[in-house]
Amino acid sequence: EEELQVIQPDKSVSVAAGESAILHCTVTSLIPVGPIQWFRGAGPARELIYNQKEGHFPRVTTVSESTKRENMDFSISISNITPADAGTYYCVKFRKGSPDTEFKSGAGTELSVRAKPSAPVVSGPAARATPQHTVSFTCESHGFSPRDITLKWFKNGNELSDFQTNVDPVGESVSYSIHSTAKVVLTREDVHSQVICEVAHVTLQGDPLRGTANLSETIRVPPTLEVTQQPVRAENQVNVTCQVRKFYPQRLQLTWLENGNVSRTETASTVTENKDGTYNWMSWLLVNVSAHRDDVKLTCQVEHDGQPAVSKSHDLKVSA
């Protein structure tokens, strides 16, 4: 009688992560008596995947009824495949004994796993920056296989070119990660702007995956100040206004000083929003001229978003 052969008909099998993989194996004879075992890898470090005789293998099921006496099909199905399952699987026939001894191995089936990249996560700088400054954004996506992936950066739909991308690890791996850093120059009009990281991979049936960051979380637009004297409202009263224009974010505190002495402090509340997303605000101070013998120096002092105060002064002439 011809010697038993272990036949693994598939040289390679490719599976999507999350699916089940069927690994085929048949033997050509019922002799010698003894169990079948499945291993991943070869040599002393091989990993036992399934033992027909004993053990608990919750993700592995036999395709046919391997307990039947005449059974010669020892194909298995491995459920919920992840990239970590990739490798070469061997169907090995053992001869019954004490202990069982390895009799013959199949040629092996290479299991390749395709896995989608995770949704890209874009993160910006920890602190806000002002227009004309360059800030860095990072984009990360993980867990994909094969390694080939493309990553693009956009600002408001315009592709960016100043970025560096790494795919790790450099060598062979079950899955990969991508990390990219883009440099973006801020402008005063960027409150409504978005930075987008776009990742394309062979496993994606839809459009590329996108991660976004709103520049509103990154930018600080400092205000411009203008102090003006309004026409006299009453005989002894002058209305002085401080126009605080084009600032972002809204967090702003204004202090009026009369000849260096604090007169009033208020927080920006009823602001008006400009088309570009920045804010305007106006504060006014009613000055009683009759209380002053000399000219009055009025100062509008603004502390914006925790930054050092900026101020604008106005000299109020007191006529004798």
């Epitope: 040289k11 390679s12 490719s14 599976v15 999507a16 390749s112 395709r114 094969p146 080939d148 992936i149 493309t150 394309a200 991979h201 062979v202 496993t203 994606l204 049936q205 839809g206 459009d207």
Partner: antibody, heavy 116, light 109 residues
Framework: VQLVESGGRLGQPGTSLTLSCTVS????????MGWFRQAPGKGLEYIGI?????SPYYASWVNGRFTISKTSTTMDLKMNSPTTEDTATYFC?????????????WGPGTLVTVSS | DIQMTQSPSSLSASVGDRVTITCRAS??????LAWYQQKPGKAPKLLIY???FLYSGVPSRFSGSGSGTDFTLTISSLQPEDFATYYC???????????FGQGTKVEIK
Amino acid sequence: VQLVESGGRLGQPGTSLTLSCTVSGFSLSSYVMGWFRQAPGKGLEYIGIISSSGSPYYASWVNGRFTISKTSTTMDLKMNSPTTEDTATYFCARVGPLGVDYFNIWGPGTLVTVSS
Amino acid sequence: DIQMTQSPSSLSASVGDRVTITCRASQSINSYLAWYQQKPGKAPKLLIYSASFLYSGVPSRFSGSGSGTDFTLTISSLQPEDFATYYCQSWHYISRSYTFGQGTKVEIK
């Protein structure tokens, strides 16, 4: 799982023509779909694809000559201003479940003849 | 755009022969290569994807190999139903575009 093309006929140069690919057994919202053509006695040529979310992508030579769109059960190919060089059998196909690098299901094709 | 060069453009062989068709890409496509069989008046049928993976239901006499720029389709023992035209098709992961080889017609000797 099945794809069937329709709309192939004898058309005049410059007169737009729309081909349809009707799918059954799966959802168009889950797969990338493609259009291909084959001139008589020639090889296969890629025209374009439409993503599962409905975004079309075209071969570099297309230059606005074709428009790909889809509804819930059909994918359309509009030939905007056909010439006699567009005479061919047009195939629709679905990409494989593992990725967009190959096409595992094809329709039987529909013949378009452009002639004056 | 990537060019795919298939050779030979045609070949004559007998039943039982071992047949090899090659496909060369003008730049690396890694393993993103598929092989199709087409018979006259019919749609293409997928044989091999990812350069070496046999599509389900395809006889094991078909095999594919290669990566980068050079690829091979092998029919280990030609059967009467294998007389057809064979096409290679690449996918480029950067341009996300597809290109076909010009085809190889396998005829009866």
